[in-house]
């Protein structure tokens, strides 16, 4: 009775069962009732990365250095090749196909979380009592000077994109 | 103890203006922040603007900037809150507070006024 | 400009009764740098000032009593009242300080029921 149905690792044809080529190789031929399934390596530059009968590798994604993209991790013939973004860039998609620059905070913005290869810079508004006043993707709001503590007054108040200015005391307003 | 005492009820015309007075007691007046608050009969808070007293910085709400304008007296540690142009919407009790201390660290408001109720009214 | 809503407008509740009334911001409160979430309760009665209850979305102030209580982060609050006394028959107001202008939730009347 032939089979209709075959084990883990294995794939049904001319109503035999044969096995898959492991991972990193590719199917040559099929096997017969007297001989196993031969596969063989996958090239330079080529992968498969299940057990399959595919009869050709799949092509190592190059990472374009004209799009900003640089290898993270150079692909073996059971893996791909991983691409990242250089420095101050960071993948359009999942799939990292290009990049495009981080987006820097406005003044009255700081950096909530710097940007890395695959994501984009996160800002956020400076709340009272804090401000930015540079265009950046690194700087954090920054506290307004504490007046006080160097025995001065608060003569301007600060804003979101502006430190306090502190004076003398004698310059107190009436 | 800190204490906010606010003038009294005021009756004015639509069209003319009202000032109302904060006197600030039992804290640093001049580097204290200064809140002005209304809220009309049955109604909820709105916040007008602000001022600190030492040096004469202020911030104003959208609605109110050019008719409302916050001024300080650090001599007599008192707050003003002048609204112009009155209309019957402005009647309200008008609340003075104290805001954020120096510290930048305590922007609500901790202390009240007892409120000052404006009615504007032909 | 932040917005912030309350619910409910109003709620019917008896002594001893468990009371929460929540606040939503427009845009987050909490501030990465120091952790905060710059929000506040109040409580008003009819015709006095509102007092001051909670800061810093939990920070019970100095004189309040304990069945006051306040959480959560980023654009959701809460006010609870685990127990309700007969004095705690008033309108509730949330309030953001995060950036001018300071705006104050609509408020939630707790009613006798």
């Known amino acids: 009775e032939p089979p209709t149905a075959c084990r883990e690792k294995q794939y049904l044809i001319n109503s035999q069962c044969c096995s898959l080529c492991q991972p990193g190789q590719k199917l040559v031929s099929d096997c017969t009732e007297f001989t196993e399934t031969e596969c063989l390596p996958c090239g330079e530059s080529e992968f498969l990365d299940t057990w399959n009968r595919e009869t050709r590798c799949h092509q190592h994604k190059y990472c374009d250095p004209n799009l900003g993209l640089r290898v993270q991790q150079k692909g073996t013939s059971e893996t791909d090749t991983i691409c990242t973004c250089e420095e101050g860039l960071h993948c359009t998609s999942e799939s990292c196909e290009s990049c495009v620059p981080h987006r820097s905070c406005l003044p009255g913005f700081g950096v909530k979380q710097i940007a890395t290869g695959v994501s984009d810079t996160i800002c956020e508004p400076c709340p009272v009592g804090f401000f930015s006043n540079v265009s950046s993707a690194f700087e954090k709001c920054r506290p307004w000077t504490s007046c006080e503590t160097k025995d001065l007054v608060v003569q301007q108040a600060g804003t979101n994109k502006t430190d306090v200015v502190c004076g003398p005391q004698d310059r107190q307003r009436a | 103890q800190v204490q906010l005492v606010q003038s009294g009820a005021e009756v004015k015309k639509p069209g003319s203006s009202v000032k109302v007075s904060c006197k600030a007691s039992?804290?640093?007046?001049?580097?204290?922040?200064i809140e002005w608050i209304r809220q009309a009969p049955g109604q909820g808070l709105e916040w007008m603007g602000s001022?600190?007293?030492?040096?004469?910085?202020?911030n104003y709400a959208q609605k109110f900037q050019g008719r409302v304008t916050i001024t300080a007296d650090t001599s007599t540690s008192t707050a003003y809150m002048e609204l112009s142009s009155l209309r019957s919407e402005d009647t309200a009790v008008y609340y003075c507070?104290?805001?954020?201390?120096?510290?930048?660290?305590?922007?609500?408001?901790?202390?009240w006024g007892q409120g000052t109720l404006v009615t504007v009214s032909s | 400009d932040i917005q912030m809503t309350q619910s409910p407008s109003s709620v019917s509740a008896s002594v001893g009764d468990r009371v929460t009334i929540t606040c939503r911001a427009s845009q987050s409160l909490l501030f990465s740098v120091n952790q905060k979430n710059y929000l506040a309760w109040y409580q008003q009665k009819p015709g006095k000032a509102p007092k001051l209850l909670i800061y810093w979305a939990s920070s019970l102030q100095s004189g309040v009593p304990s069945r006051f209580s306040g959480s959560g982060s980023g654009t959701d609050f809460t006010l609870t009242i685990s127990s309700l006394q007969p004095e705690d028959f008033a309108t509730y107001y949330c309030q953001h300080y995060y950036s001018y202008p300071w705006t104050f939730g609509q408020g939630t009347k707790v009613e006798i029921k």
């Open positions: 039992g804290y640093t007046f001049s580097t204290s922040w």
């Open positions: 507070a104290r805001g954020d201390d120096g510290s930048y660290v305590r922007w609500y408001f901790d202390h």
């Open positions: 001022i600190l007293p030492g040096s004469g910085s202020t």
